[in-house]
Interface confidence: low
């Protein structure tokens, strides 16, 4: 008789697929554009990226510091009016892109949360979740809530009034910690509450840290869903080399979780190499006239419009994994299981039930290494083959689609594999 | 107006190397990608090369080892290279141009040229 | 690599005639995020190059008659001629552009009875 089907878990929009932060409008739109109308038009880029969710602004009205002159019912009108809101709600809602907007209060003055006042901001915070929710948006974000006296009392307050509207509402919470112990005491009295922090900001580059690093967040946080990013609110390239990307982008899709970027990470969009840009958000690159500061500074293979021809592209790549993590059962909602692999190495399994299996095998050194994929570490459930398919590699070249003996498997330096095998009973 | 026109030798021995141009016109090599695709007497069409606007290439994987693609963007020519021909290698060769929509590119080809046929006999 | 499968492989019309044909593919060619197809479909007449008719399976390109029509999602695409001219006589070629590399079907031919 065949095995019984294991019960699918519940899953929530979130659980599909990445999210895709544009805390800053002008910056996405370039050319002096940023607005709301404009970010409409962008609408059928993001469905190019296979992500579920736009995290949007604030795009409140905000007077830097001043609580009286900070209005979280009023949309800023540099960037539009509630009635281009509703219009990019109902575009998004047609191309099946949900929409969480950012309530962080005091977002152009020092303090996120103003020094004081706390109780009359919550209060405004909380009429903006009822208001914004009648409007019709899917979620909300509030980031640096350390600077938030209070914060899980407050967090487990809105986090009711938005799933008391409805369970397919979500809550961010951004916090710039990276302490677990902290990320950990915030998550604890609020249950499905979604947390970006800076936790694998400092994994450095080695792939026995970064293993450390993760599995001891899963076995922390049990069963709860969790996000993957390194900021709440920065570029990849903040922190990490260009050499990495890819690699990073391959294990932030391939982890149990919802992955989180900001705009520009699916190209490497990186502030440095743009002088004069703001590290926090530097211009996008959709061509080579976006950045018309300094000529030649900007070259094809930086941009949108460079990168979407190239199938070996770092915007190929992101479409391609983002498109494998909303489609594959064990990529949605698979077990995980790290392994060792050798020394700079951090490889995992992820399953489900009779469906197929990935195998992720990620090098994080400088030099080429051959895995040693240390089987015994694994459950039985979750038991290696002698070959694997390649569905992708981070590096050109490979053959993909051509069987590899897991055995004999060589990585090129920041490479990552992603590769799949049958359910065998 | 948008045009492409294939040039090369009608003729080719065996185990020689085919060189063919594609010349562009209306349009930038900056701004597009050129594919090109071949088409045995009688049979379908099988899809060769491509070049980007950034000069990245990919191949059919099938014909891999034995072609290179190149483009000069100032002369407006495409460039396919092809060793080691044999007499299936019999064809009629056609450039063509990747669509671009203003922000994204898509895997269709809106322009075609007429085609060189490129027969491999000794 | 996907494989496209097109039927029949030869029809003979008569003109006037509403003509049918199918293409299908080896894997979806659907993303559900933007309800779109990568199908595309091309017309190529005796000694002419291959011209683009049809793309994301059912848009004709600009100056395409609309006697052409194309339908169908996922992996299962049908190319309808309402009323077949004698200037339809030709090959009719399928494409993905889902997935690199872009993979033609063998075609259909559209022959005189």
């Known amino acids: 008789r065949a095995p019984r089907c294991r019960e699918l878990p519940a899953q929530k929009w979130w659980h599909t697929g990445a999210l895709y932060r544009i805390g800053d409008l002008q910056a996405f739109q370039g050319h002096g554009a940023g607005n709301l109308a404009g970010l409409k038009g962008r609408l059928d880029y993001l469905s190019s990226l296979k992500v579920k969710g736009l995290v949007l602004g604030p795009i409140h009205k905000n007077q830097k510091d001043d609580v009286a002159q900070t209005d979280l019912l009023q949309i800023d009108p540099n960037f539009g009016s509630k009635e281009d809101f509703d219009s990019l709600l109902q575009s998004a809602k047609k191309k099946s892109i949900r929409v969480i907007l950012d309530l962080t209060p005091n977002y152009r003055g020092e303090n996120s949360w103003f020094s004081t006042q706390v109780d009359t901001v919550a209060t405004k915070v909380k009429d903006a979740l009822e208001f914004w929710l009648q409007a019709g948006v899917d979620g909300f974000q509030v980031r640096d809530i350390e600077n938030l006296k209070d914060a899980s009392s407050f967090l487990a307050e809105w986090q009711n009034i938005t799933k008391g509207f409805s369970e397919d509402r979500l809550l961010i919470a951004g916090t710039n910690s990276s302490d677990l112990q902290q990320i950990l005491s915030l998550l604890e009295s609020n249950k499905d509450l979604l947390l970006t922090s800076s936790y694998l900001s400092d994994s450095g580059s080695t792939g026995e840290h970064t293993k450390s690093l993760v599995t001891q967040y899963l076995n922390a946080t049990g069963n709860r869903w969790c996000s993957w990013s390194l900021s709440q609110a920065r570029l990849l390239t903040s922190f990490l080399p260009a050499q990495l990307l890819r690699l990073y982008q391959l294990m932030l899709f391939t982890l149990p979780g919802t992955p989180v970027f900001s705009y520009g990470d699916e190209i490497g969009l990186d502030a440095a190499a743009l002088p004069g840009q703001p590290m926090e958000a530097p211009v996008m690159l959709w061509d080579e006239s976006s950045f018309p500061d300094i000529p030649g500074a900007v070259s094809a293979n930086m941009t949108v419009k460079g990168q979407s021809e190239d199938p070996g592209s770092l915007l190929s790549l992101f479409r391609r994994l983002s498109d494998q993590r909303s489609k594959e059962r064990s990529l949605l909602h698979g077990d995980f299981h790290a392994f060792s692999a050798g020394p700079g190495l951090f490889s995992y399994i992820r399953h489900w039930d009779q469906n197929e299996r990935f195998l992720v095998v990620l090098n994080f050194g400088d030099v080429g290494l051959s895995a040693g994929l240390q089987a015994s570490d694994l459950p039985a459930s979750a038991s290696l083959p002698a070959k694997a398919d390649l569905l992708l590699s981070t590096q050109p070249g490979r053959e993909e689609g051509s069987p590899l003996e897991l055995e004999r498997l060589k990585l090129e330096p920041h490479e990552g594999l992603l590769l799949r095998f049958p359910y065998a009973a | 107006q948008v045009q492409l026109k294939e040039s090369g030798p009608g003729l080719v021995q065996p185990s020689q190397t085919l060189s063919l141009t594609c010349a562009v016109s209306?349009?930038?090599?900056?701004?597009?990608?050129v594919i090109w695709v071949r088409q045995p007497p009688g049979k379908g069409l099988e899809w060769m090369a491509v070049?980007?606007?950034?000069?990245?290439?990919n191949y059919n994987s099938t014909l891999k080892s034995r072609l290179s693609i190149s483009r000069d963007t100032s002369k407006s020519q495409v460039y396919l290279k092809m060793n080691s021909l044999q007499t299936e290698d019999t064809a009629t060769y056609y450039c063509?141009?990747?669509?671009?929509?203003?922000?994204?590119?898509?895997?269709?080809?809106?322009?075609w040229g007429q085609g060189v046929m490129v027969t491999v006999s000794s | 690599d996907i494989v496209m499968t097109q039927t029949p492989s030869s029809q003979a019309v008569s003109a006037g005639e509403k003509v049918t044909m199918s293409c299908k593919s080896s894997?979806?060619?659907?993303?559900?995020?933007?309800?779109?197809?990568?199908l595309a479909w091309y017309q190529q007449k005796p000694g002419q190059s291959p011209k683009l008719l049809i793309y994301?399976?059912?848009t004709r390109e600009s100056g395409v008659p609309d006697r052409f029509m194309g339908s169908g999602s996922g992996t299962d695409f049908t190319l309808t001629i309402s009323s077949v001219q004698a200037e339809d006589l030709a090959v009719y070629y399928c494409?993905?552009?889902?997935?690199?590399?872009?993979?033609f079907g063998a075609g259909t031919k559209l022959e005189l009875k």
């Open positions: 070049i980007w606007t950034n000069g990245n290439t």
């Open positions: 494409q993905q552009y889902y997935y690199f590399p872009y993979m």
């Open positions: 063509a141009r990747h669509y671009y929509d203003g922000t994204y590119y898509y895997g269709y080809f809106d322009y």
């Open positions: 894997q979806s060619l659907l993303y559900t995020e933007n309800k779109k197809n990568y």
């Open positions: 994301w399976a059912s």
């Open positions: 209306g349009f930038s090599l900056s701004n597009y990608g």
